[in-house]
Interface confidence: low
Amino acid sequence: MSKGEELFTGVVPILVELDGDVNGHKFSVSGEGEGDATYGKLTLKFICTTGKLPVPWPTLVTTFSYGVQCFSRYPDHMKQHDFFKSAMPEGYVQERTIFFKDDGNYKTRAEVKFEGDTLVNRIELKGIDFKEDGNILGHKLEYNYNSHNVYIMADKQKNGIKVNFKIRHNIEDGSVQLADHYQQNTPIGDGPVLLPDNHYLSTQSALSKDPNEKRDHMVLLEFVTAAGITHGMDELYK
């Protein structure tokens, strides 16, 4: 077990803070909830603290919760491939470019680390080149989320990982908005981290609303499990 993994044996409180600017529309989001890496489970509630969110909530899910991939459930035979937990408590910097097909792009930078007993994800997001009447600024996405696989590979030069995946957002007219994600994670501290073999995270997400919440918000439940690496031969012959 890595030193960082020991921090994730129980339920951990999570705080998410985002400052965003998309085509000049500035906004802030604050999120709170809990993560339980034993089950690969996240429950979070996000509130737009600046009024109405200028982009659809589903476009921010990867920035919020795929940001705290340290809560992914890594089966016993894959624990040596869990970069995310091994970087804790000092944490990691997570940078992404998200290309929305036939529309603009988000660039994000986040620091994910422990502050006391709380896992904090602080994010800056900049969005440019979006069409004012497109699927994103035109709020044409359905309020739901599909399952995805998130592909991870080691980046030995940077002592971190590279990640890429394609998100499928459902549009109200029945079509799909693709969002290509290119991600890089590097440790904040200088302690040893686990550099993984190629594998993927399997994600399931459900979006809902709090009937008692008057502010623009999103409630998120997510399960994330690592997969894609089989048991070694020594395991088979035990």
Epitope: D36, Y39, Y145, A206, V219, L221, F223
Partner: nanobody, 120 residues
Framework: ESGGGSVQAGGSLRLSCAAP????????MGWFRQAPGKEREEVAS????????YYADSVKGRFTMSQDNARSTVYLQMNSLKPEDTAMYYC??????????????????WGQGTQVTVSS
């Protein structure tokens, strides 16, 4: 609950559980099992507000949980059954999404249970 019974190893069973609408909607429905002398174990659960599932490692790839929203009913399809699957199986309902995958303490409503016996 219904659908329990006796079966040979390698066989299949399908359990079903109907819940009151208010208990079912946007909550977590779970299947638990308890073998004699053992603790109650969460086998599978489904968040009815988003159709996402949790499975215990011991049943992954063999058991499938599904839901029928119109009937407020959940199902547990159990394939490739093993003798170690022998237990009393309980259906339970939690409050909201957090219950899924969080163990028995997070579940509020419980069924009477149905026995599943797998012989070799």
């Amino acid at each position: 609950e219904s659908g329990g019974g006796s079966v040979q190893a390698g066989g299949s069973l399908r359990l079903s559980c109907a819940a009151p609408r208010s208990t079912y909607t946007s909550n977590c429905m779970g299947w638990f099992r308890q073998a004699p002398g053992k603790e109650r174990e969460e086998v599978a659960s489904i968040y009815t507000g988003g159709d996402i599932t949790y499975y215990a490692d011991s049943v992954k790839g063999r058991f499938t949980m599904s839901q029928d929203n119109a009937r407020s009913t959940v199902y547990l399809q159990m394939n490739s059954l093993k003798p170690e699957d022998t237990a009393m199986y309980y259906c339970a309902a939690g409050r909201g999404s957090w219950s899924c995958g969080s163990g028995p303490d997070e579940y509020k409503y419980w069924g009477q249970g149905t026995q599943v016996t797998v012989s070799s």
